[in-house]
Interface confidence: medium
């Protein structure tokens, strides 16, 4: 494979509903038709897979039914949305792109997007 550049924003703030969206853009050196995108979370030097999807260029990304991720693709850009985030999920989310077909295989790993999640303050009980 050849190295492939992957760009993603440095910082994203999740919404009060625990939803964070960011764009993962890759500089495709080849004419890929099959692409695999993986979101990795790095925290305390531990790297875990958050979600992954394989898609055909021009088609929708298909994550597993129980995945916390959704996404759309447009050209060499993938718009990723991660849901159900809580404060404890704050961390560096890395976009990994693999051009699976046709050969040769290309791999690109972004520098990561720091996602900050702030749990909403509970509404105070009100006495009327």
């Amino acid at each position: 494979c050849k190295a492939m550049h992957v760009a993603q924003p440095a910082v994203v703030l999740a919404s009060s509903r625990g939803i964070a969206s960011f764009v993962c853009e890759y500089a495709s050196p080849g004419k890929a038709t099959e692409v695999r995108v993986t979101v990795l979370r790095q925290a305390d030097s531990q790297v875990t897979e958050v979600c992954a999807a394989t898609y055909m260029m021009g088609n929708e990304l298909t994550f597993l039914d129980d995945s916390i991720c959704t996404g759309t693709s447009s050209g060499n850009q993938v718009n990723l949305t991660i849901q159900g985030l809580r404060a404890m999920d704050t961390g560096l989310y890395i976009c990994k792109v693999e051009l699976m077909y046709p050969p040769p295989y290309y791999l690109g790993i972004g520098n990561g997007t720091q996602i900050y999640v702030i749990d909403p303050e509970p509404c105070p009980d009100s006495d009327f």
Epitope: C1, K2, A3, A52, Y101, P102, P103, P104, Y105, L107
Partner: antibody, heavy 115, light 111 residues
Framework: QVQLQQSGTEVKKPGASVKVSCKAS????????FTWVRQAPGQGLEWMGW????????DYAQKFEGRVTMTTDTSTTTAYMELRGLKSDDTAMYYC????????WGQGTTVTVSS | QSVLTQPPSVSGAPGQRVTISCTGS?????????VHWYQQLPGTAPKLLIY???SRPSGVPDRFSGSKSGTSASLAISGLQSEDEADYYC???????????FGSGTKVTVL
């Protein structure tokens, strides 16, 4: 854990065909394709080709084009490699490996071609 | 004759550092394609050792390191151990053959 389990030893006559299977487990089958590699006795590794288990696209080494067919069966999470018109120099260990990056390998299937 | 040339054998005493070269051309390594390394212990299937020139999969000791420059690549094993006795193969894409090509293989012997 991720595993690739290949079918057993095959002994074939020249001109015959062989079909080697590779049963995958421990990961999402359609997320990775399969690479097939062979190794003749006492020789090095030889890349035969690759198949996507996402949509069945294939890419074969020119040497095997027209003689090899790679397929996958999503229902059984199994990949297959069929080689036709066997010759004595097809005698080798045949390996399947996960994805084009070949990060996990099967144990190998010995194919002997002899009259 | 392999498109990627490796020395047939290298040897070293336990604890020593050995280097295996993989020499290609402008249609493979020199064209910018990554080099991957595989270790094949006697009687077993190959195992991915280094991918993308210098990255190690989890579980591979940091005694193994890879590098690439120009039309060649190399694999270094530092602190050689008896369990490192194996055959080592490099792999890269060749755009003129339109196929992946393995190196000729190098047998590492621990003296």
């Amino acid at each position: 854990q991720v595993q690739l389990q290949q079918s057993g030893t095959e002994v074939k006559k020249p001109g015959a065909s062989v079909k080697v299977s590779c049963k995958a487990s421990g990961y999402i089958f359609t997320s990775y394709g399969f690479t097939w590699v062979r190794q003749a006795p006492g020789q090095g590794l030889e890349w035969m080709g690759w198949i996507s288990s996402y949509n069945g696209n294939t890419d074969y080494a020119q040497k095997f084009e027209g003689r090899v067919t790679m397929t996958t069966d999503t229902s059984t999470t199994t990949a297959y490699m069929e080689l036709r018109g066997l010759k004595s120099d097809d005698t080798a260990m045949y390996y399947c490996a996960r994805g084009p990056q070949m990060d996990v390998w099967g144990q190998g299937t010995t194919v002997t071609v002899s009259s | 004759q392999s498109v990627l040339t490796q020395p047939p054998s290298v040897s070293g005493a336990p604890g020593q550092r050995v280097t295996i070269s993989c020499t290609g051309s402008s249609s493979n390594i020199g064209a910018g394609y990554d080099v991957h390394w595989y270790q094949q212990l006697p009687g077993t299937a190959p195992k991915l050792l280094i991918y993308g020139n210098s990255s190690r999969p989890s579980g591979v000791p940091d005694r193994f390191s890879g590098s690439k420059s120009g039309t060649s690549a190399s694999l270094a094993i530092s602190g050689l151990q008896s369990e490192d006795e194996a055959d080592y193969y490099c792999l890269s894409w060749d755009e003129s053959l339109n196929a992946y090509v393995f190196g000729s293989g190098t047998k590492v012997t621990v003296l």
